[in-house]
Interface confidence: medium
């Protein structure tokens, strides 16, 4: 997995209107990290370890890039033609990423109402989008005002490939952000669903990288897709991710069902609680 | 009240460039997501989209037509013209100007009629 | 380009009949289709935007239905004054293209 980082800005219009406010969200190796959701924007770290990433300072730096940006992608929508009436949406996101190789990639991608339209290669200078009429359309505007002012948008469009890693490797010289392995602490529970049957569920939580393999298994055979149901996997606010798998078994058969488990290339596997014990748990290292 | 006005030579040669003016009140070109366009229709004929002007000097064209039109605005004025090199007789129709915001065209003005012969 | 097919290209009604006046474009252009109403030596006027939406001051026996790349324009209760020809606007993508038009004529 590359280190990367991820800007997703977002700004609205209404009736045609560009509206004062943007949402921006910064992502850290696909963590929330940075977050600017007022009409005046201050950087919040999203949890103590994005705060651990920061340091121990204000983030005026961040703030400053946040708005500067939150701004100019504002004009990039007021510069958008034929908008329709009702709420509109513009959406830039910009991600660089460092790989192991310590080669780069960084690229842009533009969104309007949740439609990706343009796309940039930040390294190649390279824009593509998509074959749809609309895109092109969109993608003409948007490139034609880039084009013409880009002097008003030096903040925004200028150096972003370079101003993104730089950012990123500030991020990952604090020490915190490290090519590292947390095992998942894993939970199994049981829930009555209806007579004779109950619901087992399986949760991981507090693992990275997010890549993992969790499913159940009746007498050591992995149970079909369709008889399992899974929860995306998110990050837990803690630089870490959680997920969980459940499904359905009658009553009286716990001990032939195991949660199975898989990450970093260590695996384990969990046995459903029986009686009245509701939880395991069981945290491997 | 919004009105829009037309007006050109009439008669042209072929061969020669036609120019077009678009007069305009009631609202001005220099309002954010405000644009004016011309549209020409041959006599008994449907509706041809030729050029587009918005509010930031943005300029559209027809892709057929592109290499002949020339679209400009005075905004301090309330007029957008039109010019057409190398007319010939498939030009000849009614030149239409009209206001476009959100996407349609909400106000037309009552067209000029440009007829081309030798 | 994105074609706009009108059919019929001609509609012959007596007054008081409901019609239909079909639209379809050659690829999906969600709802951004609009209709215009032309009647003789007089400029385009804008009846429907967005393939359903009622327009200020247009009769209330017009509206619009459709969307993707098949679309309706209809009249509720034909009058005298609606015979003209209605042209149908892609909307959607760039460059912007009219269909052929159908022409109302009452019997």
């Known amino acids: 997995e590359p280190h990367s980082l991820r800007y997703n800005l977002t700004v609205l219009s209404w009736d045609g209107s560009v509206q004062s406010g943007f949402l921006t969200e910064v992502h850290l190796d696909g963590q929330p990290f940075l977050r600017c959701d007022r009409q005046k924007c201050r950087a919040k770290p999203q949890g103590q370890w994005a705060e651990d990433v920061l340091g121990n300072k204000t983030w005026d730096r961040e703030t400053r890039d946040l708005t500067g940006n939150g701004k100019d992608l504002r004009m990039t929508l007021a510069h958008i033609k034929d908008q329709k009436e009702g709420l509109h949406s513009l959406q830039e996101i910009r991600v660089c990423e460092i790989h192991e190789d310590n080669s780069t990639r960084s690229s842009q991608h533009f969104y309007y109402d949740g439609e990706l339209f343009l796309s940039q290669n930040l390294e190649t200078k390279e824009w593509t989008m998509p074959q749809s009429s609309r895109a092109q359309t969109l993608a003409m505007n948007v490139r034609n005002f880039l084009k013409e002012d880009a002097m008003k948008t030096k903040t925004h469009y200028h150096a972003m490939h370079a101003d993104c890693l730089q950012e990123l490797r500030r991020y990952l010289k604090s020490g915190v952000v490290l090519r590292r392995t947390v095992p998942p602490m894993v939970n199994v529970t049981r829930s009555e669903a209806s007579e004779g049957n109950i619901t087992v569920t399986c949760r991981a939580s507090g693992f990275y990288p997010w890549n993992i393999t969790l499913s159940w298994r009746q007498d050591g055979v992995s149970l079909s897709h369709d008889t399992q149901q899974w929860g995306d996997v998110l990050p837990d606010g803690n630089g870490t991710y959680q997920t969980w798998v459940a499904t359905r078994i009658c009553q009286g058969e716990e001990q032939r069902f195991t949660c199975y488990m898989e990450h970093s290339g260590n695996h384990s596997t969990h046995p459903v609680p029986s009686g009245k014990v509701l939880v395991l748990q069981s945290h491997w290292q | 009240q919004i009105t829009l006005k037309e007006s050109g030579p009439g008669i042209l040669k072929p061969s020669q460039t036609l120019s077009l003016t678009c007069s305009f009140s009631?609202?001005?070109?220099?309002?954010?997501?405000?644009?004016v366009g011309w549209i020409r229709q041959p006599s008994g004929k449907g509706l041809e989209w030729l050029a587009h002007?918005?509010?930031?000097?943005?300029?559209y064209y027809n892709p057929s037509l592109k290499s002949q039109l020339t679209i400009s605005k005075d905004t301090s004025r309330n007029q957008v013209f039109l010019r057409i090199t190398s007319v010939d007789t498939a030009d000849t129709a009614t030149y239409y100007c009209?206001?476009?915001?959100?996407?349609?065209?909400?106000?037309w003005g009552q067209g000029t009629t440009l007829t081309v012969s030798s | 380009d994105i074609v706009m097919t009108q059919s019929p290209a001609t509609l012959s009604v007596t007054p008081g009949d409901r019609v239909s006046l079909s639209c379809r474009a050659s690829?999906?252009?969600?709802?951004?289709l609009h209709w215009y109403q032309q009647k003789s030596h007089e400029s385009p006027r804008l009846l429907i935007k967005?393939?359903?939406q009622s327009i200020s001051g247009i009769p209330s026996r017009f509206s619009g239905s459709g969307s993707g790349s098949d679309f309706t324009l209809s009249i509720n209760s034909v009058e005298p004054e609606d015979v003209g020809v209605y042209y149908c606007?892609?909307?959607?993508?760039?460059?912007?293209?009219f269909g052929g038009g159908t022409k109302l004529e009452i019997k």
């Open positions: 967005y393939a359903s």
């Open positions: 690829q999906s252009i969600s709802d951004y």
């Open positions: 009631g609202f001005s070109l220099s309002t954010s997501g405000m644009g």
């Open positions: 009209a206001r476009r915001t959100q996407g349609y065209f909400d106000y």
């Open positions: 606007q892609n909307g959607h993508s760039f460059p912007w293209t």
């Open positions: 002007i918005w509010w930031d000097d943005d300029k």
